[in-house]
């Protein structure tokens, strides 16, 4: 019995269906096919879980969280024992193993391994201003999404004709910050932060209004 090499990893957007491949070749008839799909969750690597099982002509459910979401892609018994996972959740991310036995065929590699990564687009980021908006002050524009896998990058732009940040601004796309030093009237305006990763983007807006000192009355 020989389980075919897997592609290594599968990536899928949260809520979509993932297909985890596993196929094998055997010299024996499929009279006593035994297939066990296990997962080592990324969130809890020392707690492997059963996903779905096929034994003695019957299918058995795995862990409760997979109930109603998992099945074999084809009619069993078969040499293609790939499974699907519907409505993928972040917690489904992990290393999946298919263990195949088909007596009396012994020997060979009977385990296939496939990684599953559930991707999450950035959630709507929060835009904030840190620091005084008085003329000549330094301000930091903050942008952060609570969710996003892979981790989002953040791009700030000023919504004017140029879409360029003020010349005194420095941007950190990983942290999602823009530091604007010595703000002036030209710094005022609408700023947009775009949070993006491999599967999506999300934006927030921030209105920076530089406060000029009031002329003193005599």
């Amino acid at each position: 019995l020989e389980v075919s090499e897997s592609p290594g990893s599968v990536q899928v957007a949260r809520g979509q269906t993932a297909v985890l491949p596993c196929a094998f070749s055997t010299s024996a008839a499929l009279l006593n096919l035994n297939v066990i799909w296990m997962v080592i969750p990324l969130s809890n690597a020392n707690q492997p879980e059963q996903v779905i099982l096929y034994q003695g002509g019957q299918m058995f459910d795995g862990a409760l969280r997979f109930h109603g979401r998992v099945g074999f892609t084809g009619t069993m018994p078969a040499t293609n024992v790939s499974i699907f996972i519907n409505n993928t959740q972040l917690s489904d991310t992990g290393t999946y193993q298919c263990l195949v036995n088909n007596l009396p065929d012994r020997g060979g590699r009977n385990i296939g391994v496939t990684g599953l990564t559930v991707l999450v687009p950035p959630s709507a980021p929060q835009c904030q201003i840190q620091g005084s908006q008085d003329l000549g002050s330094d301000v930091i524009l903050l942008c952060s999404s609570e969710e996003g896998i892979p981790r989002p990058t953040y791009l700030w732009e000023k919504l004017d004709n140029t879409l360029k940040l003020p010349p005194t601004a420095t941007q950190d796309q990983v942290q999602g910050t823009v530091t604007i030093r010595n703000i002036s009237a030209l710094s005022s305006g609408l700023y947009q932060c775009v949070a993006s990763n491999a599967i999506g983007t999300s934006t927030c807006l921030l209105d920076l209004q530089v406060i000029s000192p009031q002329p003193r009355s005599v």
Epitope: L31, N32, I36, L53, G57, F60, D61
Partner: antibody, heavy 126, light 107 residues
Framework: EVQLVESGGGLVKPGGSLRLSCAAS????????MNWVRQAPGKGLEWVSS????????YYADSVKGRFTISRDNAKNSLYLQMNSLRAEDTAVYYC???????????????????WGQGTMVTVSS | EIVLTQSPSSLSASVGDRVTITCRAS??????LNWYQLKPGKAPKLLIY???ILQSGVPSRFSGSGSGTDFTLTISSLQPEDFAAYYC?????????FGQGTKLEIK
Amino acid sequence: EVQLVESGGGLVKPGGSLRLSCAASGFTFSSYSMNWVRQAPGKGLEWVSSISSSSSYIYYADSVKGRFTISRDNAKNSLYLQMNSLRAEDTAVYYCARGQLLWFGESALIDAFDIWGQGTMVTVSS
Amino acid sequence: EIVLTQSPSSLSASVGDRVTITCRASQSISSYLNWYQLKPGKAPKLLIYAASILQSGVPSRFSGSGSGTDFTLTISSLQPEDFAAYYCQQSYSTPRTFGQGTKLEIK
């Protein structure tokens, strides 16, 4: 204490219907497949039906296919067997049994009926 | 379907005896065989699974052996509580099937 208690048996005429129940306690019912097994008077055991923990997969013996329906309610920790078009040969003690997947060898599994109820008698007679 | 044939159908023995019950499958079932004990009015009990593995809580006087088509259940030294009916059952294929049973009686 892990326990299965069957109920609903009784005397019924041929062609009639009966619904058996099995109340589970002492274990996480929703994590196990469940089975009905019967024993006719003076005969051996006969597997009747099984249902997976999520109710996704259901299996029947040929002798009851199309007449019996197995179901479960995980919220109520209960297993059921709806028996229609009953025949004299369905007369038996009906047991509910928990299906347990047990590891053996390097990576092999076997399912066994590891917890049983005491049974309920079903008599089909005119 | 796989047919399991148990022998003997009934057996008389005394406390302290060594008893062997056999179960033969109509085709090879590897080690996919379980043994159960049945007593009237009581819940049946799983004794051995996968032909030879003792279920938790079962006394060590019970043992199982065999593979393929021929299996045995042995009780090394009969105790009064062992007088009951014994059944083998295969989980190799669907439908799951049982042997016809062996009734163990006091001599």
